[in-house]
Amino acid sequence: AGHLEQPQISSTKTLSKTARLECVVSGITISATSVYWYRERPGEVIQFLVSISYDGTVRKESGIPSGKFEVDRIPETSTSTLTIHNVEKQDIATYYCALWEV
């Protein structure tokens, strides 16, 4: 079964800059999975942000402008990266990655 690890316990960024969060997949080939990213803001329910499927198709949450989040998958390092553009106070949250095995 697949296992996920988010090596960055926390990340601090300057406003308007770019943040990159990593999710390392082990126990399964990342190219055979779909990786989902969610965020949980303080006091709010968890929210889907973006996903990248086994075939590379990206899907995003409709309420968020299309350029805000970027998701990538690097098979060589078995890592999925969530890039947050134009970091703002509303981005303060806990970010989770999740795996769907095909």
Epitope: S62, I64, P65, S66, H85, E88
Partner: antibody, heavy 116, light 107 residues
Framework: EVKLVESGGGLVKPGGSLKLSCAAS????????MSWVRQTPEKRLEWVAS???????YYPDSVKGRFTISRDNARNILYLQMSSLRSEDTAMYYC??????????WGQGTTLTVSS | DIVMTQSQKFMSTSVGDRVSVTCKAS??????VAWYQQKPGQSPKALIY???YRYSGVPDRFTGSGSGTDFTLTISNVQSEDLAEYFC?????????FGSGTKLEIK
């Protein structure tokens, strides 16, 4: 049927201000990100501003500090307040439904001309 | 900023032919590319998203392909109503950017 109708365009002198509106119907407006895109007289498309369903705003450097995008989810209206207008802001302004999939519906556009 | 280059400003084709419009991104944008059609006097209409997915109601003669930096919009069995300008766009990251457009002319 999704419908986006822009209004508010016109002729403005350099340095002037103008507010554009976009009335949305046919979908749950409050659930979608929205954007403004302009088309220059040379027919180039340029992204102008985006706003999330929750009100977070995003701009390219070319309009940052001069343009403000906002929304009224109760009335299903998207706005673009423009100030310190320049001749290079002359364009057809379109509102578009953003989010995912992006820019799937566009309005018919409203024209802004900045000239003395 | 990511530059989207459509090197062909004009393309000429005949009804029934197959034509390919190309777009090159200045850096990797994955599959975060959309294509739009703009007919004379009209606003842009969405054709393709995620590089290869057709928007609802778009005829299946329109096909998108590519990933990374190179993208193609192929129109098979070209119809007279396909006379239009075609724009690519990347939505991988801000600022969102568009190609300069390729105008399709029907012989």
């Amino acid at each position: 049927e999704v419908k986006l109708v822009e209004s508010g365009g016109g002729l403005v002198k350099p340095g002037g201000s103008l507010k554009l509106s976009c009335a949305a119907s046919g979908f749950t407006f409050s659930s979608y990100a929205m954007s403004w895109v302009r088309q220059t007289p040379e027919k180039r498309l340029e992204w102008v501003a985006s706003i999330s369903s929750g009100g977070s705003t995003y701009y390219p450097d070319s309009v940052k500090g001069r343009f403000t995008i906002s929304r009224d989810n109760a009335r299903n209206i998207l706005y673009l307040q423009m100030s310190s207008l320049r001749s290079e802001d002359t364009a057809m302004y379109y509102c578009a439904r953003d989010g995912y999939p992006p820019f799937d519906y566009w309005g018919q556009g409203t024209t802004l001309t900045v000239s003395s | 900023d990511i530059v989207m280059t459509q090197s062909q400003k004009f393309m000429s084709t005949s009804v029934g032919d197959r034509v390919s419009v190309t777009c090159k991104a200045s850096q990797n944008v994955g599959t975060n590319v959309a294509w739009y059609q703009q007919k004379p006097g009209q606003s842009p209409k969405a054709l393709i998203y995620s590089a290869s997915y057709r928007y609802s109601g778009v005829p299946d003669r329109f096909t998108g392909s590519g990933s990374g930096t190179d993208f193609t919009l192929t129109i098979s069995n070209v119809q007279s109503e396909d006379l239009a300008e075609y724009f690519c766009q990347q939505y991988n990251s801000f600022p969102l950017t568009f190609g300069s457009g390729t105008k399709l002319e029907i012989k």
